[in-house]
């Protein structure tokens, strides 16, 4: 029987008695920045090359005894999880280890930086195939460590890191908080977030996805044939590094953005019990557990999108929050969310030649989040069309008037503090799916895109009575690009996308009378690309 | 994930330009910033990563490091350049007294300085 963690990441079609997925990442090199390792362990012998890089601080304490097996335990186990013969994810991947953690598992930001620089120089001297860098470590938030990760990622390297074992917001740690790295939290055999002593896995918007990270069997440095169970977000990150190696081996040309989108797309959705996370973090934490794709040939025909949450704006009246997509992703829609419901909407705006999503806090509000829907849309030409507040009672409207442009998202932003409390709801006229409609006192922003074969449609779900949550999902084959609420519902806290579902949240129904304003309508814009589908068929 | 985000401490030292043979005010009137880990036990004072502006060449990094050493020596401080970065970020790693931070922040090409801190196996 295969260990639970390998079974969990393996799609059903691979599940035989033995974990033997095709092509085990042989075209990929995985760099491990960790403790020293026992490279002659039978699990990893011949698979891991120990570089001469070492940058570690001295061990603490006068009574510390350097015991080789203790010094090697963390790194050896992780190397085994990534590429071990019996218990590894990507059995064909070759690895290189750099020692940046001492025998107590402690290192420095500076040592890690020098290690990352070593990898970049090695890459320049001897370019190989795709590179994955595994960073199974965490320290406090570090601007310089995040910046170094960003530079390495922009040089085409995939960085995977541990979210941290502090049962805390991963955004407070580095490199977990670097947007360019793939940050991994840990779950157990019951798909619960991992508890470690009094602490446990980190969570929050800086986590990209979760992976098995409790009771993971792997190589033990106690002897060359020993195995041991270890736990932590390092083990979870090692699983994702292995999955990334498998994906890159199958499709070596994948960019970081494409890889991240695929990791998210093929993950198991909504299996984690969110009650474990602090209440204010639940909406921000992705409910995703990593898995290998069901086949090794590409899923290039799909329109991939993910949701990116901003940092919290803070409570000041003019506070704003900004959510950004990765460099090779398109921002297809922008929404906002506030727990207090006091917000002034959101807008898409250009910043440094790229669209960003900005949400606006309102007077008396506790702060807002901006939520960007970031998609992979090759050859896309997107723009934002804005209509200022209308004078007419019919409300503000804006549509995509350029030939061949389709509507991918609607945003609205207003200056008045309490929009809609004394106004009747505005309903969007039927049969006009290519336009955004909003309150007459709001400016409306339409995201309009032209891309080969791109088609979109609007889907609505309205509930006449007040409800805390209204959802509408795109059907199979379509991808959610836009998520918003129809105007006129004053008690709406905001809208956001969860996988392929648009969620509109309202204030607690007990505080909202069952008036005409109780009606809540969630509006989803669902798109697909016929061009991507055709291109994929031609490749096959 | 946000690059500008994080519960870290930022000390922005707005500095007067002192008369000092080698000191130049940072260009465009921008002020270099100092960062350190918010988690006190993880701080490693005495070692600093001096990050230079993006397009700074290796020779300029080395020159800036030497300049810092010279100015520190003039004030009676010993410094040690532990590493000069190039390839990913321009800058250098220096072992020095925290008393010299004000001086270092005024060096040409300096974008920000970060105090070294611990990282841990997870």
């Amino acid at each position: 029987s295969i260990p639970w963690n390998l079974e969990r990441i393996t799609p059903p079609r691979y599940r035989a008695d033995e974990y033997q997925p095709p092509d085990g990442g042989s075209l990929v090199e995985v760099y491990l920045l960790d403790t020293s390792i026992q490279s002659d362990h039978r699990e990893i012998e011949g698979r891991v090359m120990v570089t001469d890089f070492e940058n570690v601080p001295e061990e603490d304490g006068t009574r510390f005894h350097r015991q080789a097996s203790k010094c090697d335990s963390h790194g050896t186990h992780l190397a085994g999880v990534v590429s071990g013969r019996d218990a590894g994810v990507a059995k064909g991947a070759s690895m290189r280890s750099l020692r940046v953690l001492n025998c107590q598992g402690k290192g420095t930001v500076s040592g890690t930086l020098i290690g990352l620089e070593f990898i970049r120089k090695s890459q320049l001297v001897q370019p190989v195939g795709p590179l994955v860098v595994l960073l199974p470590l965490a320290g406090g938030y570090s601007r310089v460590l995040n910046a170094a990760c960003q530079r390495l990622a922009r040089a085409g390297v995939v960085l995977v890191t541990a979210a941290g074992n502090f049962r805390d917001d991963a955004c407070l740690y580095s490199p977990a908080s670097a947007p360019e790295v793939i940050t991994v939290g840990a779950t157990n055999a019951q798909d619960q977030p991992v508890t470690l002593g009094t602490l446990g896995t980190n969570f929050g918007r800086c986590v990209d996805l979760f992976a098995p990270g409790e009771d993971i069997i792997g190589a033990s440095s106690d002897c060359s044939t020993c195995f041991v169970s270890q736990s932590g977000t390092s083990q979870a990150a090692a699983h994702v590094a292995g999955i990334a190696a498998m994906m890159l081996s199958a499709e070596p040309e994948l960019t970081l953005a494409e890889l991240r989108q695929r990791l998210i797309h093929f993950s198991a959705k909504d299996v984690i019990n969110e009650a474990w996370f602090p209440e204010d973090q639940r909406v921000l934490t992705p409910n995703l557990v990593a898995a290998l794709p069901p086949s090794t040939h590409g899923a290039g025909w799909q329109l991939f999108c993910r949701t990116v949450w901003s940092a919290h704006s803070g409570p000041t009246r003019m506070a704003t929050a900004v959510a950004r997509c990765a460099p090779d992703e398109e921002l297809l829609s922008c929404s906002s969310f506030s727990r207090s419901g006091k917000r002034r909407g959101e807008r898409m705006e250009a910043q440094g030649g790229k669209l960003v999503c900005r949400a606006h806090n309102a007077f008396g509000g506790e702060g807002v989040y901006a939520i960007a829907r970031c998609c992979l849309l090759p050859q896309a030409n997107c723009s934002v069309h804005t209509a200022p507040p209308a004078e007419a009672s019919m409300g503000t409207r804006v549509h995509c008037h350029q030939q061949g442009h389709v509507l991918t998202g609607c945003s609205s932003h207003w200056e008045v503090e309490d929009l809609g409390t004394h106004k009747p709801p505005v309903l969007r006229p039927r049969g006009q799916p290519n336009q955004c409609v909003g309150h007459r006192e709001a400016s409306i922003h339409a995201s309009c895109c032209h891309a080969p074969g791109l088609e979109c449609k609007v889907k609505e779900h309205g509930i006449p009575a007040p409800q805390e949550q209204v959802t509408v999902a795109c059907e199979e084959g379509w991808t959610l690009t836009g998520c918003s609420a129809l105007p006129g519902t004053s008690h709406v806290l905001g809208a956001y996308a969860v996988d392929n579902t648009c969620v509109v949240r309202s204030r607690d129904v007990s505080t909202t009378g069952s008036t005409s304003e109780g009606a809540v309508t969630a509006v989803a814009i669902c798109c697909r690309s016929r061009h991507l589908a055709q291109a994929s068929q031609e490749l096959q | 994930q946000e690059d500008e985000d994080g519960d870290y401490e930022e000390l922005v030292l707005a500095l007067r330009s002192e008369e000092d043979g080698l000191a130049e005010a940072p260009e465009h009137g921008t002020t270099a910033t100092f960062h350190r880990c918010a988690k006190d036990p993880w701080r490693l004072p005495g070692t600093y990563v001096v990050v230079l502006k993006e397009e700074t060449h290796l020779s300029q990094s080395e020159r800036t490091a030497r300049r810092l050493q010279a100015q520190a020596a003039r004030r009676g401080y010993l410094t040690k350049i532990l590493h000069v970065f190039h390839g990913l970020l321009p800058g250098f790693l220096v072992k020095m007294s925290g008393d010299l931070l004000e001086l270092a922040l005024k060096l040409p090409h300096v974008d920000y300085i970060e105090e070294d801190s611990s990282v841990f196996a997870q």
Partner: antibody, heavy 130, light 107 residues
Framework: EVQLVESGGGLVQPGGSLRLSCAAS????????MSWVRQAPGKGLEWVAN????????YYVDSVKGRFTISRDIAKNSLYLQMNSLRAEDTAVYYC???????????????????????WGQGTTVTVSS | DIQMTQSPSTLSASVGDRVTITCRAS??????LAWYQQKPGKAPKLLIY???SLESGVPSRFSGSGSGTEFTLTISSLQPDDFATYYC?????????FGQGTKLEIK
């Protein structure tokens, strides 16, 4: 699924010796500490001894110290209990059990998190009588 | 050595009842306590670890609580299959000790 099968029990005279074996399946055997637990007729459970994955650490209940030796052979996926100087009070059903636990790091310290004995053998009976 | 004392030694109850078994440690063991169920002629089965974590595959009617020296095992609604002997076990150190057991029988 991991299975544990004990053998080696039997009737022995006081002062005699016996060697119990426990055969396991799968790589998970060598990944965990292992224990021997005994149960005298009509009585409760008594932990006897345990051993680390690589055999480098061993612990015993006071009443068997110096008489019993726990060992394991990773290559054979086997656990052993060598019992010398047996006494009447050692009469019991002897179970081998897997001590499921995991190691993790927390801010520079290596910790052990123990779940309990999650897999047990069916037991082997040892009778010490003249 | 740490002593573990279970109470009661025997407990009579009916199907559907809510029952509680207590385990007391002679010194603090934090949350390092497990509960086992044993039926006649069978090996014990792990139910709860770390005082309150439910082992995989164990019905949710079983729950554990406590820390320090006082611990309880609760069965929210007794099922016919639950009549057995229950043991607590401490593992504050690498040397373990069991409680003397609580026999749960049909009233």
């Amino acid at each position: 699924e991991v299975q544990l099968v004990e053998s080696g029990g039997g009737l022995v005279q006081p002062g005699g010796s016996l060697r119990l074996s426990c055969a396991a399946s799968g790589i998970t055997f060598s990944s965990y500490w292992m224990s021997w637990v005994r149960q005298a007729p009509g009585k409760g459970l008594e932990w006897v001894a345990n051993i680390k994955q690589d055999g480098s650490e061993k612990y015993y209940v006071d009443s068997v110290k110096g008489r019993f030796t726990i060992s394991r052979d990773i290559a054979k996926n086997s656990l052993y209990l060598q019992m010398n100087s047996l006494r009447a009070e050692d009469t019991a059903v002897y179970y081998c059990a897997r001590d499921r636990g995991t190691y993790y790091y927390a801010s520079g310290s290596y910790n052990y998190y123990y779940y309990g004995m999650d897999v047990w053998g069916q037991g082997t009976t040892v009778t010490v009588s003249s | 050595d740490i002593q573990m004392t279970q109470s009661p030694s025997t407990l009579s109850a009916s199907v559907g009842d809510r029952v509680t078994i207590t385990c007391r440690a002679s010194q603090s063991i934090s949350s390092w306590l497990a509960w086992y169920q044993q039926k006649p002629g069978k090996a014990p089965k792990l139910l709860i670890y770390k005082a309150s974590s439910l082992e995989s595959g164990v019905p949710s009617r079983f729950s554990g609580s406590g820390s320090g020296t006082e611990f309880t095992l609760t069965i929210s609604s007794l099922q016919p299959d639950d009549f057995a002997t229950y043991y607590c076990q401490q593992y504050n150190s690498y040397s373990y000790t069991f409680g003397q057991g609580t026999k749960l029988e049909i009233k």
